[in-house]
Structure formats: structure tokens, C-alpha cells
């Protein structure tokens, strides 16, 4: 009786079990009662990757550079060409027929897995203690700066998008502030001493001036570079002196119109 089923690597045709063609070969003719299955090797640009009874080999996949593809592995008579994407791109699908650019992880997110030719960037939110302030396809979440290791203290807490801001500790701040204050006090004392000395030196005028209005004492008269005739300088709240403009009276003015 003719067989109803055949062994592995065989197929049933015309009541006969014929050998399948091995990978890399195509079927030319079925076996007969007197002959084996006839197979022929696939040509250079073709392949068959299984035991088969195909009369035509499959064409190797073409890695189209216009779609961002390049050859990762050249095809053989038994394997198809494997395409991958150019640098900065990854496959759109498992079959890798075209490529798309890798996505970047936004600020607050870091790269968990860098993209490859076949997979996109995997991002993850930066956990507490880490931050990312850039949009990047490569950068992971970076740890907050450790102020302690620099003998500094946290002045501003970090977020998932910003690093902590470190500042000097109170003891350090004191070491800076105290000398400055002492310096300022020293300058003030110096000025006071100079003033007292001036007042003590000046002789009193005995001549009567009954109608004369009391004169304004100009403490700066004897200071080098001072001009008693010049109008007194105005000062802004920033302590920067502002020279009196020519042609204007020296008086406290109403807000000037712009």
C-alpha cells in the first residue's frame, strides 16, 4: 500500500515518500520509483533556510541605504541577509524593513538602556538622589552632588531635573563675615578719628556776625581732591555716587520725566 505519512525530512507525492531538499538547495524534480529527489544549489543572491520542496529559492533581503539600512550579516545560500540600522537609528519592526531615529530622554529622565540598531532608547524617571537636566539619547540620571564630601552644606535641594546647590557651612561663613565686619568697623573708626582731629584743630572766629546765617560745615573740605565749591553728590541706594549734572541746581528734585 502507498504510504500515508513519511519520515522526517521527507514529503509525500504520487504515493511516494521523497527526500526534501537540504537548506541552500531548491527542488528540481520529485523522486520517482527509480530516482532520488533532485535538488540544485541556490544562486549567489538567493537562499533557502529549511529542508524544503521549493522550486525557487528566496531572494536575499536588500538593505536599502535610503531607508537607513545597512548589512549586518551577508546572506548565504542557507541564510537571509540581516539588515541593521545606521548609527543613531533603530529598526521600526522586528523584520527591520526601515529605520527611525533613536528617541532622547527628556530632562527628569535618564537612559536606562542605550538604543541599538534594533531597539530604541529605554528611558527611566530619575529616582530621588538623581537628576538629568538635558535631553539626551545617551546620558543616564546623574547623582546629586554630595555637598558633605566637599565640606559644604545643601543650600538648595535637588530635583529630578536639577542638581543640589551647595554652600559654605555656618562656621565657614563666620570666618568670612567677621573679618569683613571688622574691616568696615576699622574704616569707620578711622574716619571718626580724622573728623575729631579736624574739629579740634579749627580756631573759633570771635568776630560778630549777627545777621549771618549759620554756615554749613563741610567735613570734606580738607580731604585731598575735594572741591568745596562743587555741589554735593547725590547717591543712589546702591551706594554708587552720582555726579551732579552741569546746568542743574543741586536740590532734591521731583521725579524727572523720562
Amino acid at each position: 500500500e502507498p504510504p500515508t505519512a513519511c519520515r522526517e525530512k521527507q514529503y509525500l507525492i504520487n504515493s511516494q515518500c521523497c527526500s526534501l531538499c537540504q537548506p541552500g538547495q531548491k527542488l528540481v524534480s520529485d523522486c520517482t520509483e527509480f530516482t532520488e529527489t533532485e535538488c540544485l544549489p541556490c544562486s549567489e543572491s538567493e537562499f533557502l533556510d529549511t529542508w524544503n520542496r521549493e522550486t525557487r529559492c528566496h531572494q536575499h533581503k536588500y538593505c536599502d541605504p535610503n531607508l537607513g539600512l545597512r548589512v549586518q550579516q551577508k546572506g548565504t545560500s542557507e541564510t537571509d541577509t540581516i539588515c541593521t540600522c545606521e548609527e543613531g537609528l533603530h529598526c521600526m519592526s522586528e523584520s527591520c524593513e526601515s529605520c527611525v531615529p533613536h528617541r532622547s530622554c527628556l530632562p527628569g529622565f535618564g537612559v536606562k538602556q542605550i538604543a541599538t540598531g534594533v531597539s530604541d532608547t529605554i528611558c527611566e524617571p530619575c529616582p530621588v538622589g538623581f537628576f538629568s537636566n538635558v535631553s539626551s539619547a545617551f546620558e543616564k540620571c546623574r547623582p546629586w552632588t554630595s555637598c558633605e564630601t566637599k565640606d559644604l552644606v545643601v543650600q538648595q535641594a535637588g530635583t529630578n531635573k536639577t542638581d543640589v546647590v551647595c554652600g559654605p557651612q555656618d562656621r565657614q561663613r563666620a570666618l568670612v563675615v567677621i573679618p569683613i565686619c571688622l574691616g568696615i568697623l576699622f574704616v569707620i573708626l578711622l574716619l571718626v578719628l580724622v573728623f575729631i582731629k579736624k574739629v579740634a584743630k579749627k580756631p573759633n572766629d570771635k568776630a560778630p556776625h549777627p545777621k549771618q546765617e549759620p554756615q554749613e560745615i563741610n567735613f570734606l573740605d580738607d580731604l585731598p581732591g575735594s572741591n568745596p565749591a562743587a555741589p554735593v553728590q547725590e547717591t543712589l541706594h546702591g551706594c554708587q555716587p552720582v555726579t551732579q549734572e552741569d546746568g542743574k541746581e543741586s536740590r532734591i528734585s521731583v521725579q524727572e520725566r523720562q
Epitope: 520509483e33 527509480f34 532520488e36
Partner: antibody, heavy 112, light 112 residues
Framework: EVQLEQSGPGLVKPSQSLSLTCSVT?????????WNWIRQFPGNKLEWMGY???????NYNPSLKNRISITRDTSKNQFFLKLNSVTTEDTATYYC?????WGQGTSVTVSS | DIVLTQSTLSLSVSLGDQASISCRSS???????????LNWFLQKPGQSPQLLIY???NRFSGVLDRFSGTGSGTDLTLTISRVEAEDLGVYFC?????????FGSGTKLEIK
């Protein structure tokens, strides 16, 4: 139903060529199989002479040296035997066969 | 060339009896795929040979199950389980594993 029908002369003079035709019906000779010529000498001894394959390629019995040629006409679904320089030793019944199906046989006598 | 020896030239059996016909090859007929292309034919008087068994043990379509083939690469046997009158004729083995194809000399089955 596959059928093979033979035709050709039954008498050939020594040193001449023997030519036989096999007409196939019910199956195309270009589809598959080997299309053989076999002869049977007096006393029942069988000898395979050669074949033409479905693809037109040949294989011959080395004992027939360069005397044999098997050709075909695919448009008529026929294949042919030509045996050159025959001698009386070539006297036999000639069969065309696919092996599972055989022609009726042609008795050929080589005599002057 | 491969020589197929059918040592029994003639076999005489009674109707209903079993007959075994042997064919021995000078070398293995098994090919690299594990197939053995050994066939059995019956040639009835005045007829062309007809295929009974192919590839050692496969019955050709229409062949009765009284006919069976067994054997390995070099020793092959055709068995007729219950001989009938229509079975008489000459039985040939033919190998088509190696070119040139070769036939056995034949075993004549006669009825007692």
C-alpha cells in the same frame, strides 16, 4: 494512463544505423523521469542502453561506447534511439521504457 | 559494473505454494540517502516486462499483495506467497542505484 508506443524498422544492415522512435502519451517527457532504451537478446538477457532525462541530459551504458545517441522532440513528446555501426550482435528486441511503463518492444534483426 | 546474480535459473512450484526468488548484488545498492533502488519485474511469455516491486519492498500500483520484496543492500528476495497460474514467466531484478543500470539474468517460474 501512461503509454509508450514504439516504431522503427525490424531489419537493419550491418554497419548501418539503427533508429527507433518512442511516442509517449498520458505524460510529458519534460515533467520528470528517465526515458530509457533497453534491449533483450535471444536467451532473455536484458541490457540497459541509456536514458534521456526530463531535462534533456543523457546517460549511456559505457559498453556501447560512442555508438549510441538518445534524443527527443518535446513538441511531439517523443524520444529516439540511434545506434551506429551495428553488427549481428545488436540483433535483439528493443524496448523504450520509463521502467514502470514499457513499450511493446521492437524486434530488430541485423543482417545483410 | 554491478553484477546481479540470480542463482536459480528455473523454479518449479505447485499452485498455492510459496516461491522465493533470490538476487545477490556484487556491491551494496544502498545510496547515501539510505535508499536501495532494487526493482523486480515479471515478463510473461510474449509480453514486455512489468514492474512488480520498486525500492526493495514497495509494491507497484495494481500489484497483488501476494508479491512482497525483502532484503538489504546486497541480498534481495522476491516472495510469492501463494503461486497462481498467471504468475508464470521470467522474474528479473534490476538495480538503478548505480550507472550503468544492470539486470539479473532472470529466474523462470514454472508450475508443477
Amino acid at each position: 494512463e501512461v503509454q509508450l508506443e514504439q516504431s522503427g524498422p525490424g531489419l537493419v544492415k550491418p554497419s548501418q544505423s539503427l533508429s527507433l522512435t518512442c511516442s509517449v502519451t498520458g505524460y510529458s517527457i519534460t515533467t520528470n523521469y528517465h526515458w530509457n532504451w533497453i534491449r533483450q537478446f535471444p536467451g532473455n538477457k536484458l541490457e540497459w542502453m541509456g536514458y534521456i532525462k526530463y531535462d534533456g541530459s543523457n546517460n549511456y551504458n559505457p559498453s556501447l561506447k560512442n555508438r549510441i545517441s538518445i534524443t527527443r522532440d518535446t513538441s511531439k513528446n517523443q524520444f529516439f534511439l540511434k545506434l551506429n555501426s551495428v553488427t549481428t550482435e545488436d540483433t535483439a528486441t528493443y524496448y523504450c521504457a520509463r521502467l514502470d511503463y514499457w513499450g511493446q518492444g521492437t524486434s530488430v534483426t541485423v543482417s545483410s | 559494473d554491478i553484477v546481479l546474480t540470480q542463482s536459480t535459473l528455473s523454479l518449479s512450484v505447485s499452485l498455492g505454494d510459496q516461491a522465493s526468488i533470490s538476487c545477490r548484488s556484487s556491491q551494496s545498492l544502498e545510496n547515501s540517502n539510505g535508499n536501495t533502488f532494487l526493482n523486480w519485474f515479471l515478463q510473461k511469455p510474449g509480453q514486455s516486462p512489468q514492474l512488480l516491486i520498486y525500492k526493495v519492498s514497495n509494491r507497484f500500483s495494481g500489484v497483488l499483495d501476494r508479491f512482497s520484496g525483502t532484503g538489504s543492500g546486497t541480498d534481495l528476495t522476491l516472495t510469492i506467497s501463494r503461486v497462481e497460474a498467471e504468475d508464470l514467466g521470467v522474474y528479473f531484478c534490476l538495480q538503478v542505484t548505480h550507472v550503468p543500470f544492470t539486470f539479473g539474468s532472470g529466474t523462470k517460474l514454472e508450475i508443477k
